[in-house]
Interface confidence: low
């Protein structure tokens, strides 16, 4: 499995789109800051088998897609940017899916690294709960956008390490 230069470009475009989605200054939302306890240890990439790392990355992309494809999300962000964001995420998920199948085979895929995947799911549950509690306010969305940018940066770094192993 080769996480190609194209995939790397997709990563950069995803981060760029996330940056451009910003609608209000983060400085006006300081009071809404929140620690979502990003499961950083799942993105260390040292102790992982390649297939495990890819599964975690795929889950990250999937959950990000789920978060930004809700009705509340489409009301908060520029539709054009969202549409482009979806396309980039889809492309990345397709690339990662191909890699998972190539690395471990179809049968094993669903059970890959369940603990790490659950950690990512719980992380996104905390984000969803925060948005609900904040009634999907513009500042809450801005805090979440900044958080997702941070987590996508970790994903990108893990993918870089995986490419170096190729």
């Amino acid at each position: 499995c080769n996480l190609s230069q194209t995939h790397s470009l997709n990563n950069r475009r995803t981060l760029m789109l996330m940056a451009q989605m910003r609608r209000i200054s983060p400085f006006s939302c300081l009071k809404d800051r929140h620690d979502f306890e990003f499961p950083q240890e799942e993105f260390d990439g040292n102790q992982f088998q390649k297939a495990q790392a890819i599964s975690v990355l795929h889950e990250m992309m999937q959950q990000t897609f789920n978060l930004f494809s809700t009705k509340n999300s489409s009301a908060a962000w520029d539709e054009t940017l969202l549409e482009k964001f979806y396309i980039e995420l889809f492309q990345q998920m397709n690339d990662l899916e191909a890699c998972v199948i190539q690395e471990v085979g179809v049968e094993e895929t669903p059970l890959m690294n369940e603990d790490s995947i659950l950690a990512v799911k719980k992380y996104f549950q905390r984000i969803t709960l925060y948005l609900m509690e904040k009634k999907y306010s513009p500042c809450a969305w801005e805090v979440v956008r900044a958080e997702i940018m941070r987590s996508l940066s970790f994903s990108t770094n893990l993918q870089k390490r995986l490419r170096r192993k190729d």
């Epitope: 940056a19 451009q20 400085f27 940017l81």
Partner: antibody, heavy 119, light 108 residues
Framework: QVQLVQSGAEVKKPGASVKVSCKAS????????MHWVRQAPGQGLEWMGE????????IYNENFKSRVTMTRDTSTSTVYMELSSLRSEDTAVYYC????????????WGQGTLVTVSS | EIVLTQSPATLSLSPGERATLSCSAG???????LYWYQQKPGQAPRLLIY???NLASGIPARFSGSGSGTDFTLTISSLEPEDFAVYYC?????????FGQGTKLEIK
């Protein structure tokens, strides 16, 4: 091709309101935020605010917040900017400009509408 | 509010000369959101440079942009007669979006 066509020049008295329109064509109207920028005679550019034509969400510059209202009509692909409590210093050319991604940001502008406030 | 200060206010040069226009931000601007526009009398502004250093469609290669943080520059390597106009830097890094006061490039 993308076109933004604005309404004609207006002359208003101090204290009155003005409503400027901007009709968009050549692209999917609801996909891009529309912005309003004004320019007083011989002066620089000043951003007034923006509206998301899809659901009408607006973000205004605090300098205008109490006096400006931006609306849209998706059936005619038109956005409107209404400025109330006009004063002489509001005499300016008002432009609509389309938002977008990267090189599309403010790449398209209306021709401008001159609003003159005079007693 | 991020205040953008352009210098000089007026720049008098001859065709063929190199023009360097500066834009200084009161606080740091993400370079992805620093743009340059050209405006001629009676016309709407025209996008020249986006994201600090990228040339907009149809803009000649003699225009270039650079900078980061609080200091940005627009350079015209060899002035053509049609380049004499007013130039504005613009940021949409944070609300409210702002423009510099403009630099008027005039024929010497």
């Amino acid at each position: 091709q993308v076109q933004l066509v604005q309404s004609g020049a207006e002359v208003k008295k101090p204290g009155a309101s003005v409503k400027v329109s901007c009709k968009a064509s050549g692209y999917t109207f609801t996909n891009y935020w529309m912005h309003w920028v004004r320019q007083a005679p011989g002066q620089g550019l000043e951003w007034m605010g923006e509206i998301n034509p899809s659901h009408g969400r607006t973000i205004y510059n605090e300098n205008f917040k109490s006096r400006v209202t931006m609306t849209r009509d998706t059936s005619t692909s038109t956005v409107y900017m209404e400025l109330s409590s006009l004063r002489s210093e509001d005499t300016a050319v008002y432009y609509c400009a389309r938002g977008g991604l990267g090189p599309a940001w403010f790449a398209y502008w209306g021709q401008g509408t001159l609003v003159t406030v005079s007693s | 509010e991020i205040v953008l200060t352009q210098s000089p206010a007026t720049l008098s040069l001859s065709p063929g000369e190199r023009a360097t226009l500066s834009c200084s931000a009161g606080s740091s601007v993400d370079s992805s959101y620093l743009y340059w526009y050209q405006q001629k009398p009676g016309q709407a502004p025209r996008l020249l440079i986006y994201s600090t250093s990228n040339l907009a469609s149809g803009i000649p290669a003699r225009f270039s942009g650079s900078g980061s943080g609080t200091d940005f520059t627009l350079t015209i390597s060899s002035l053509e007669p049609e380049d004499f106009a007013v130039y504005y830097c613009h940021q949409w890094s944070s609300y409210p979006f702002t423009f510099g006061q403009g630099t008027k490039l005039e024929i010497k």
